[in-house]
């Protein structure tokens, strides 16, 4: 029986050109950790395997980058890392947790627009 | 502009069975990541189920995992969730919603009413 739950970081933003850690904690279970995948809605970003470590896929392996701990850190981010980003947790004996992180990129130029019509 | 219009809610017994239907108009329906959301009374709405714009990959929150499955019918540009073994924490306002690659969801359902009784 699945007793767990999984914790993120939830809806988060961040700029352009900057970098997010995304993040998931899995708790309320004794079950043993054996993987955990990172992927987007299309693809498969990376793998943390208990036994083998980290596995980044080629198309990602210049802008993120493993940890901290079970998380991920996205670098150099574009418009188009907009989206959302799933951790799955292989657990046994419990079987998978998915946790859900959906990330908006923000042009630069969003935070300098909103800053001119602050009234002082 | 897409406009989704969801079906398929109702009242059913505990350990039954529904099917939500979500049909797509005005848009390139196979462009779309769509997901289903359900908001119960006094809580905040939830993500329930992703499925790609490809259809190859589907996301479930764990709380209905196995027992909620997502799947899309491009020839008829509708998103279907199908529900069994329905509990009564099920019940909820469930919403169709849509989006872009590399956008919020932004195109949402009027939403259909689940009511799981004990």
């Known amino acids: 029986m699945m007793t767990g739950t999984i914790e993120t970081t939830g809806n988060i933003s961040a700029e352009k050109g900057g970098s997010i850690i995304l993040q998931c904690h899995l708790s309320s279970t004794t079950a043993q950790v054996t993987q955990v995948n990172w992927e987007q809605q299309d693809q498969l970003l990376a793998i943390c395997n208990a036994d083998l470590g980290w596995h980044i896929s080629p198309s990602f392996k210049d802008r993120v980058a493993p940890g901290p701990g079970l998380g991920l850190t996205l670098q150099s981010l574009t418009v188009n890392d907009t989206g959302e980003y799933f951790c799955i947790y292989h657990t046994y004996p419990d079987g998978t947790y998915t946790g859900r992180i959906f990330l908006e990129v923000l042009e630069s130029s969003v935070a300098e627009h909103g800053a001119r019509f602050q009234i002082p | 502009e897409v406009q989704l219009v969801e079906s398929g809610g109702g009242l059913v017994q505990a350990g039954g069975s529904l099917r939500l239907s979500c049909a797509a108009s005005?848009?390139?329906?196979?462009?779309?990541?769509m997901g289903w959301f359900r908001q119960a009374p006094g809580k905040e709405r939830e993500w329930v189920a992703t499925?790609?714009?490809?259809?190859?990959?589907?996301y479930y929150a764990d709380s209905v995992k196995g027992r909620f499955t997502i799947s899309a019918d491009n020839a008829k540009n509708t998103v279907y969730l199908q529900m069994n073994s329905l509990k009564p924490e099920d019940t909820a306002v469930y919403y169709c919603?849509?989006?872009?690659?590399?956008?919020?969801?932004?195109?949402w359902g009027q939403g259909t009413q689940v009511t799981v009784s004990s």
């Open positions: 919603a849509a989006r872009p690659n590399y956008r919020d969801y932004e195109y």
């Open positions: 005005g848009g390139t329906f196979r462009s779309y990541v």
């Open positions: 499925i790609n714009s490809s259809g190859s990959r589907t």
